[in-house]
């Protein structure tokens, strides 16, 4: 309706003697400015004054001046806009109409507001959600509909009184559309918190109590138990009766369904709060509890572990580890069920009681050949002796034994024969599958752990075998002490240390390298005839004539063998020289004769001088002398000189003579 | 025993935003609440939000408009998302479990995860 | 908000000595909170529900306090006491914080 003025405002609020009033409020006038307002408590309209009448709690006038009796209440408001109030403090006879009466040039308007003031301050309000179920967090909210800027407030939280321990919001609205304080507590209820009591505390700015409002908390919960066991300390002996009592000490809501259950699997036809549980066996023990469900869930109680006693079960033994390797460390444990826990053991190996061995477990730290067998244990507790069970068997694992290489042959062996060996050993675990012998060779393997050596060689000294399974164990080497016919004879010199001049002491060495057996016997030879029999041939003096082929021979009792043929070289100076006239010594005059210098001589002669029987040297130096055409004059005894590195040596006088040839006869 | 660990990628670009995990052991996500704290270098401790068992959140006003909180509770997970980060956002981020479901004080803190905001 | 104001923010002190320090709250807080943190550390919860000692704690500390004021007290300090304190309050969120006092050795 546009004849209508539009006012905004809570429509009644609310406040407590002693405490204020704030009216949030706007408006729009028909027309124009705000030219006079009176805010009138419960007021009514006078039809004969057309006028309203009622207290006239605020008024202001043209000129804007109020008068001093009215600072109670307050128009914070202006002349077009605004029309808030605040009354402070507030009594109880505020409560009622509160009358806004409004005009401008040319209208007027009366707004009503309802005004609602208790003696005492009202409590606030606790809404809670429709369900609260354990864990799952809720928002508890305070409403109280009261707010104003000059009566600071608190709302707190109190769970049985004491102050809440989670944090709140706390908000507060001063709206045309509502006035309110309001605290959220946002917490997670635990079944523990069913039927408590929660309250929201109104207080004042310094934590003075003003009012509160109360709720019992309703958490929804899975039934929560307590199991009781007899005996108490669920420990009995089989035969022994249990009886087991689940109680239920909060459900919300009721229970429904009531179950036992053994190591998490349900008990058939157990249905009822007690659990009788006669002559027990000891398949019995284990982890008992209760279930029991509500619309919510399913609740456990907490485990009771039953232990039903019994005297210890045929042992087992469990070996870490088998087989065992030779050396290493070996754990055994006896396995035995039995409750309480065997105190006591008894350990056999092979049958016969192991002395000081009484725990669970054996320790051998360094396992040897022997330890193999059988072992076996017997457990004791309190209720008796078990049995002894088949035991478990170590299998110690070791390389092979003793290992050593055999010769097969008769001794002794020679160089060129065959040879048989074989490798042999005194135990093994695995079984030996291979053998390897050094040095390696062509050789043949005719069967598993035998070599055969065909020609065995000189220089086949030593051999070694090895036996294998999951390791190799090597024999000492074994010598075969092959013999042989001395080997490498050879003629050594020994002196002189430089070439052989006649005349010199010669030594010459028959050596060789080795020779198995070691002793032999020595022949020197030259031209096939023997000169002696010791390992040296010595020249006192040596000439010209000892040279030649020598050999040595060394022989012992597998055989002989000679040097190579060693050439014995003497140098010396020319010797036996002479001087050889061909044709002959007689040459007729005119012919050519041809004068030799002959000589022996090492090395041979170098250079020739020729004399003649005046000793006058000629010039001529090579080995012949060739006159042509031959004259009378010469006539004469010649001589020849050779020269060696050795030395000189001459000839003897030869005498040429030339005869007149016939012409020269006849012209004479 | 219960335990929190952080993870987080150490440094971010400025206006970047940051992701953050905390893995917890020794107790159940959907029983408590999970915490988010910071602290500046050389500075004091900030709370930022938290996760509630049944995974509703509450954030701190002041950086509501930014934060994220989320959970896997099967995998032990609790993430931190915040956007549009600035060189002022440079701290150690902690996540922290209260002595009780929802209350009581910080009984555990995870190590922390220092996070660098720079070009 | 409410703002959690610790006083001293530095304290040094001997070992030996009594050790107090205090955290004065804008509006009144149910219950104060006490951490106790060094370098390098996460922080550690000491005291809850303003006089309870978290587990592990020495009894040399203790806390106290209501409404709007509380405080920490170390009996006698310990050379391993030093450290920076922080006081946190769980009435209203946002949850707070003070800004510390840090704990020194003379």
């Known amino acids: 309706d546009s004849s209508k003025w539009v006012f905004e405002h809570p429509e009644t609020l609310y406040a407590w003697e002693g405490a204020c009033v704030w009216i949030p409020c706007t408006y729009r006038a028909l027309d124009g400015d705000l030219e006079s307002f009176i805010l009138f408590h419960n007021p009514e309209y006078n039809k004969n004054t057309s006028k309203f009448d009622g207290t006239r709690l605020y008024e202001s006038t043209k000129d804007g001046k109020v008068p001093s009796e009215q600072k109670r209440v307050q128009f914070l408001g202006d002349k077009n806009k605004n029309c808030t109030l605040s009354i402070h403090p507030v009594h109880l006879n505020d409560s009622g109409q509160l009358g806004l009466r409004m005009e401008s040039k040319t209208e007027k308007w009366m707004e009503r507001i309802h005004l609602n003031v208790s003696e005492r301050p009202f409590p606030p309000h606790i809404q809670l959600p429709p369900e609260i179920q354990e864990s799952q967090e809720v928002t508890l909210t305070c409403l109280l509909n009261f707010s104003c800027y000059g009566y600071p407030i608190q709302l707190q939280w109190l769970l049985e009184g004491v102050p809440m321990r989670q944090a709140a919001v706390t908000s507060t609205s001063l709206t045309i559309k509502s006035v309110f304080t309001r605290s959220e507590l946002k917490f997670s209820p635990q079944w523990s918190h069913h039927g408590k009591i929660v309250t929201c505390q109104l207080q004042d700015a310094d934590g003075k109590f003003l009012s509160n409002d109360t709720v019992q908390l309703n958490v929804k919960h899975t039934p929560k138990l307590e199991i009781k066991v007899t005996p108490s300390d669920a420990i009995v002996r089989e035969g022994d009766s249990v009886t087991m009592t689940c109680e239920v000490s909060s459900s919300n809501p009721e229970y429904t369904t009531v179950s036992w259950l053994k190591d998490g699997t349900s008990l058939k036809k157990q249905n009822t709060f007690t659990l009788n549980l006669r002559e027990v066996t000891k398949d019995q023990s284990g982890k008992y509890c209760c279930q029991v469900s509500n619309d919510v869930g399913p609740g456990r109680s907490e485990e009771v572990f039953l232990q039903v006693q019994y005297a210890p079960e045929p042992s087992t033994v469990q070996i870490l580890h088998s087989p065992a390797v030779e050396g290493s460390q070996v754990e055994f444990l006896c396995m035995s069920l039995a409750n309480p826990l065997p105190t006591n053991y008894t350990w056999y190996h092979n049958g016969k009681e192991m002395q000081g061995r009484t725990e669970e477990k054996v320790h051998i730290p360094k396992i040897l050949p022997w330890h193999a067998g059988t072992y076996s244990c017997v457990a004791e507790n309190i209720l008796g002796t078990g049995q002894r069970g088949p035991g478990a068997e170590l299998d110690v694992q070791y390389p092979p034994k003793k290992v050593t290489t055999v010769i097969q042959n008769p001794m002794p062996i020679r160089e060129g024969d065959t040879v048989t060996l074989s490798c042999n050993y005194n135990s093994s675990n695995p079984s030996v599958t291979r053998y390897e012998w050094k040095p390696h060779g062509a050789w043949e393997e005719p069967s598993l752990g035998v070599l055969k050596i065909q020609n065995v060689g000189w220089d086949n000294t030593t051999i070694a075998c090895a036996a294998c399974n999951s390791w190799c164990s090597w024999a000492s080497p074994v010598a075969l002490n092959v013999q042989y016919a001395p080997r490498d004879v050879r003629v050594r010199k020994i002196k002189p240390l430089s070439e052989i001049h006649s005349g010199n002491s010669v030594s010459l060495q028959c050596d060789f390298s080795s020779s198995h057996p070691k002793e032999v016997q020595f022949f020197w030879e030259k031209n096939g005839r023997l000169l002696g029999k010791e390992s040296q041939l010595n020249f006192d003096s040596i000439s010209p004539e000892d040279a030649g082929s020598y050999s040595c021979w060394v022989n012992n009792s597998i055989g002989q063998t000679a040097s190579k043929a060693w050439t014995l070289e003497v140098l010396y100076a020319p010797r036996r020289l002479r001087v050889s006239m061909s044709p002959g010594d007689q040459v007729m005059e005119g012919k050519s004769a041809t004068l030799t210098c002959e000589s022996d001589a090492n090395p041979p002669v170098s250079h020739y001088t020729w004399f003649d029987w005046n000793n006058q040297s000629l010039p001529y130096h090579s080995q012949k002398l060739r006159l042509e055409p031959v004259k009378v004059q010469h006539s004469g005894a010649y001589w020849c000189q050779g020269t060696n590195s050795v030395g000189k040596g001459r000839s003897p006088l030869s005498t040429l003579t030339v005869y007149y040839s016939p012409e020269t006869i006849g012209r004479r | 025993q219960v335990q929190l660990k952080e993870s987080g990628p150490g440094l971010v670009a400025p206006s970047q935003s940051l992701s953050i995990t905390c893995t917890v052991s020794?107790?159940?996500?959907?029983?408590?609440?999970v915490h988010w704290v910071r602290q500046p270098p050389g500075k004091g401790l900030e709370w930022l939000g938290m996760i509630w068992g049944g995974g509703s959140t509450d954030y701190n006003s002041a950086l509501k408009s930014r934060l994220s909180i989320s959970k896997d509770n099967s995998k032990s997970q609790v993430f931190l998302k915040m956007n549009s980060l600035q060189t002022d956002d440079t701290a150690m981020y902690y996540c922290?479990?209260?002595?009780?479901?929802?209350?009581?004080?910080?009984?555990?803190w995870g190590q922390g995860t220092l996070v660098t905001v720079s070009a | 908000q409410i703002v959690l104001t610790q006083s001293p923010a530095i304290l040094s002190t001997s070992p030996g000595e009594k050790v107090t320090m205090t955290c004065s709250a804008s509006?009144?807080?149910?219950?104060m909170y006490w951490y106790q943190q060094k370098p390098g550390s996460s922080p550690r919860l000491l005291i809850y529900d303003t006089s309870n000692l978290a587990s592990g704690v020495p009894v040399r500390f203790s806390g106290s306090g209501s409404g709007t004021s509380y405080s920490l007290t170390i009996s006698r300090m310990e050379a391993e006491d030093a450290a920076t304190y922080y006081c946190?309050?769980?009435?209203?969120?946002?949850?707070?914080f003070g800004a510390g006092t840090k704990l020194e050795l003379k």
């Open positions: 922290a479990r209260p002595h009780d479901f929802d209350a009581g004080g910080f009984a555990y």
């Open positions: 509006s009144r807080v149910n219950y």
């Open positions: 946190q309050q769980w009435t209203s969120y946002p949850l707070t």
């Open positions: 020794g107790f159940s996500l959907s029983r408590y609440t």
